[in-house]
């Protein structure tokens, strides 16, 4: 059931009133308004949009709306010296050049300030050499190349297809392999769904379309020049040589027309197996270098982008809580886009705008939430989650004491098949209960709940009759709140059918073709999926801000902790000889999980029985729930990743987008058979088991009776 306990309440001022006020037509209108020109971070256009949102949020009725600015490191192409890649002959003549820009979509031919495709934060350079095709440039792809095929990437330019993992991990892997440059391209196997036309006639990627994106390896640091602290007016900035996470070799993205020209000449080794072949009519030879007739030709990169300290602007809106104003529920999503941002981020920003409008309408009628709601329009997400991270760094002391929950609101859609949710286990029951109350927008599920269509289309692999909810990874603005500060977090969007659509993300991701028309014509003409996502995100915020008892169930954490302990144990047991030799025991971890399970169960019983009319006891119980996520934070952070401090979850070291459970143990075990000093390596495994067991036990004790 929904809650309606705040002050000045009338019967209509409840969850239903809030949800009924959300309108698909408004989301459509807001999306159109936000997507007519580019809003690249650090540009005047994005500053103007920040001021517009500030003004509109004030009109909608928020108590205050402020701009929070920071001066952070951004990256832009050189306007007079474009980036491109050439094939050069033995005389050094350029016999083929990649395109300098994407052909603009219909109706946008005269739009200025469309940034050409580039890899943000690439260093400058003009390396030339032989090409090596490295598949997706994943850790396992380089293992295959180096260990099985004995192919050395040192001094080579590598070409990798986009997909499967975050592009920054690809670049890091290429650097570690000794490459001197990286070419990233979109293969039709990953970005062209069969039976669908290319934009503007469908939602597929045309051959001239290119995915932009940053190639940093920040590991949660935020602004590369001010890790751990806000990039404010008195900040001390590192020199560029000491900046966090910058790539050391030139990187550039291309489309599949240009990739065809590079890949069709490849010689050397054949692809090791079919998983290395994409959909282009090329052999997918690994190289190194071109085949016979073309063996004297080389590839040359021309990269002239510059890194610049630039001002960015977050918009922070406040709706003060009536009962617990010092408890914050945050709804945040980014505003900056690579070009028009038709999906990323404006399909999310339009939903946030409508959620703010609905809350504002209720507030104007005399309602207030129990707890304070903060709304955020983040800047520079595309450049490394910079706006959200700097704001959280500036406000960390408030957030760690007052932060109840963070709900992320980037792209509302990446497909139109079913719901996709990633969140802390504390929110599982909230999401289940909410989606049972919402109508499904899906064809064939008229009159059925969202929970029902979601469960049917995306069933949990473990629990029958329940939907899949995934672990939080990173690659979006919840990172600092969850991974660094330990604030319970969640995200929801509509997604594709992963069974039938094997392409990575959505085909037009970060291209010039991500327009309003893409959404309005092909993804969600009625904006019914956007409305559903608004109801899920908004409903979560409403319940988190307004329920008397926080809608967190600690028993669900107990269930996943046991599952994660089982999984990491089984990974470790794949090395039985070493486990025996070094006397590796998981007793402490399983014992801690058992204790957590028992204490969580008892806490849940007390939660049912306590006197909710006693404000002190109510606050005490709610604080135990709020601080449970915080209890999984290790102040020392993970090895070599000080800003990833959550012991249960971290972004995978091999793919920033994916979440890994018990990441400290997992990383200690990864590729352990190749470590030069096994005794030291297994000692680190034992240490990480100790850290995990201690943390789980310590978290359990926060749920014990206080005295």
């Amino acid at each position: 059931k929904s809650s309606n306990e705040a002050t000045n309440i009338t019967p209509k001022h409840n969850m239903k009133a809030f949800l009924d006020e959300l309108k698909a037509e408004n989301i459509k209108k807001f999306l159109y308004n936000f997507t007519q020109i580019p809003h690249l971070a650090g540009t005047e256009q994005n500053f103007q949009l920040a001021k517009q949102i500030q003004s509109q949020w004030k009109e909608f009725g928020l108590d205050s709306v402020e701009l929070a600015h920071y001066d952070v490191l951004l990256s832009y192409p050189n306007k007079t010296h474009p980036n491109y890649i050439s094939i050069i002959n033995e005389d050094g003549n350029e016999i083929f050049n990649t395109s300098l820009f994407e052909p603009p979509p219909p109706g946008y031919e005269n739009v200025s300030d469309i940034v050409p495709p580039f890899s943000a934060f690439s260093p400058q350079g003009m390396p030339e050499g032989d090409l090596v095709y490295v598949n997706y440039a994943r850790t396992e792809d380089f293992f295959k190349l180096e260990r099985d095929m004995k192919i050395n990437c040192s001094g080579k330019i590598v070409i990798a297809r986009y997909g499967k993992v975050f592009r920054g991990n690809k670049v890091k892997n290429a650097q570690l392999a000794g490459a001197k440059g990286v070419i990233l391209y979109s293969d039709p196997a990953d970005y062209f769904a069969p039976g669908v036309k290319s934009y503007p006639d469908g939602w597929n990627l045309p051959g001239g379309g290119v995915q932009r994106g940053n190639i940093l390896n920040l590991n949660g640091a935020g602004d590369p020049l001010t890790p751990g602290y806000p990039a404010n007016e008195y900040a001390y900035r590192r020199g560029i040589a000491e900046a966090v996470g910058l790539p050391s070799i030139p990187v550039h993205p291309i489309g599949y027309y240009d990739a065809q020209k590079l890949l069709e000449k490849m010689g050397g080794s054949a692809p090791p197996d079919s998983s290395w072949r994409g959909s282009l009519k090329v052999p997918y030879n690994v190289g190194p270098g071109f085949t016979g007739n073309f063996s004297t030709q080389k590839v040359k990169m021309h990269i002239h982008s510059t890194n610049e300290v630039t001002r960015i602007y977050n918009v922070i809106g406040t709706l003060r809580g009536a009962v617990e104003p010092d408890r914050y529920v945050i709804l945040g999503g980014h505003r900056d886009s690579w070009v028009f941002g038709g999906i990323d981020p404006q399909s999310g920003a339009a939903v946030v705008h409508e959620i703010v409008r609905s809350f504002g309408t209720l507030k104007k009628e005399g309602w207030r939430p129990r707890r304070t709601i903060l709304f955020a329009s983040w800047d520079a997400e595309e450049f490394g989650l910079l706006g959200s991270t700097e704001w959280a760094e500036e406000n960390s002391r408030l957030l760690q004491e007052r932060g109840v929950a963070y709900i992320n609101a980037d792209s509302s859609i990446e497909g139109n098949y079913t719901l996709r949710v990633d969140c802390t286990p504390l929110m599982y029951s909230l999401v289940h209960n909410l989606t049972k109350e919402l109508k499904s927008p899906d064809e064939g599920f008229e009159g059925k709940s969202l929970y029902e269509s979601w469960t049917k289309k995306s069933p949990s692999p473990e629990f029958s009759g329940m939907p899949r909810i995934s672990k939080l990874g990173s690659g979006n603005d919840f990172e600092v709140f969850f991974q660094r500060l330990g604030i319970a977090s969640g995200r929801a969007r509509y997604t594709k059918n992963w069974e039938t659509n094997k392409f990575s993300g959505y085909p037009l991701y970060h291209s010039v073709y991500e327009t309003y028309e893409l959404v309005e014509k092909f993804y969600d003409p009625m904006f019914k999926y956007h409305l559903t996502v608004a109801q899920v995100r908004g409903g979560m915020v409403f319940e988190l801000a307004n329920s008397i008892v926080l809608p967190f169930d600690c028993r669900d954490y107990a269930v996943v902790l046991r599952k994660y302990a089982d999984k990491i144990y089984s990974i470790s047991m794949k090395h039985p000889q070493e486990m025996k030799t070094y006397s590796v025991s998981f007793d402490s971890l399983f014992s801690a999980v058992k204790n957590f399970t028992e204490i969580a169960s008892k806490f849940s019983e007390r939660l049912q029985d306590f006197d909710k009319s006693n404000p002190i006891v109510l606050r005490m119980m709610n604080d135990q729930l709020m601080f449970l996520e915080r209890a999984f934070i290790d102040p020392l952070g993970l090895p070599d990743r000080p800003f990833y401090r959550h012991v249960i979850y971290a972004p995978s070291s091999h793919n920033k987008y994916a979440g890994e459970s018990f990441p400290g143990i997992y990383d200690a075990l990864f590729d352990i058979e190749s470590k030069v000093d096994p005794s030291k390596a297994w000692g680190e495994v034992k240490r990480q088991i100790y850290v995990a067991a201690f943390t789980v036990q310590a978290a359990a004790e926060t749920l014990s009776e206080v005295a």
């Epitope: 599952k563 302990a565 089982d566 590796v584 998981f586 058992k594």
Partner: nanobody, 112 residues
Framework: EVQLVESGGGLVQPGGSLRLSCTVS????????VSWVRQAPGQGLEWVSS???????YYADSVKGRFTISRDDSKDTLYLQMNSLRAEDTAVYYC??????WGQGTLVTVSS
């Protein structure tokens, strides 16, 4: 004191089946994951399968689809059902709690 005692080994023809059991004592069985590990003659230890405290199962590629691990918490017993046995499955099979607590092993010989 933790004890793990395996039984059920023996001689079986290729293609045949066998069911191993491991009875445990000295710890609360249902709170822990447990495993089967084997050692073929003249070879090192090889992980075969694990079952989690939550009931999740994990298998080595070499036995996937042929072996099934299970547990009966009420009897403090772990099982390994082995079907479609091959000569290369010949080994001493150990029940293991982790790197510290192991059984003495039971010999499985697959031969015609």
């Amino acid at each position: 004191e933790v004890q793990l005692v395996e039984s059920g080994g023996g001689l079986v023809q290729p293609g045949g089946s066998l069911r191993l059991s491991c009875t445990v004592s000295g710890f609360t069985f249902d709170d822990y994951a447990v495993s089967w590990v084997r050692q073929a003659p003249g070879q090192g230890l090889e992980w075969v399968s694990s079952i989690g405290a939550g009931g999740g199962t994990y298998y080595a590629d070499s036995v996937k689809g042929r072996f099934t691990i299970s547990r009966d918490d009420s009897k403090d017993t772990l099982y390994l059902q082995m079907n479609s046995l091959r000569a290369e499955d010949t080994a001493v099979y150990y029940c293991a709690k982790d790197g510290v607590d192991w059984g003495q092993g039971t010999l499985v010989t697959v031969s015609s």
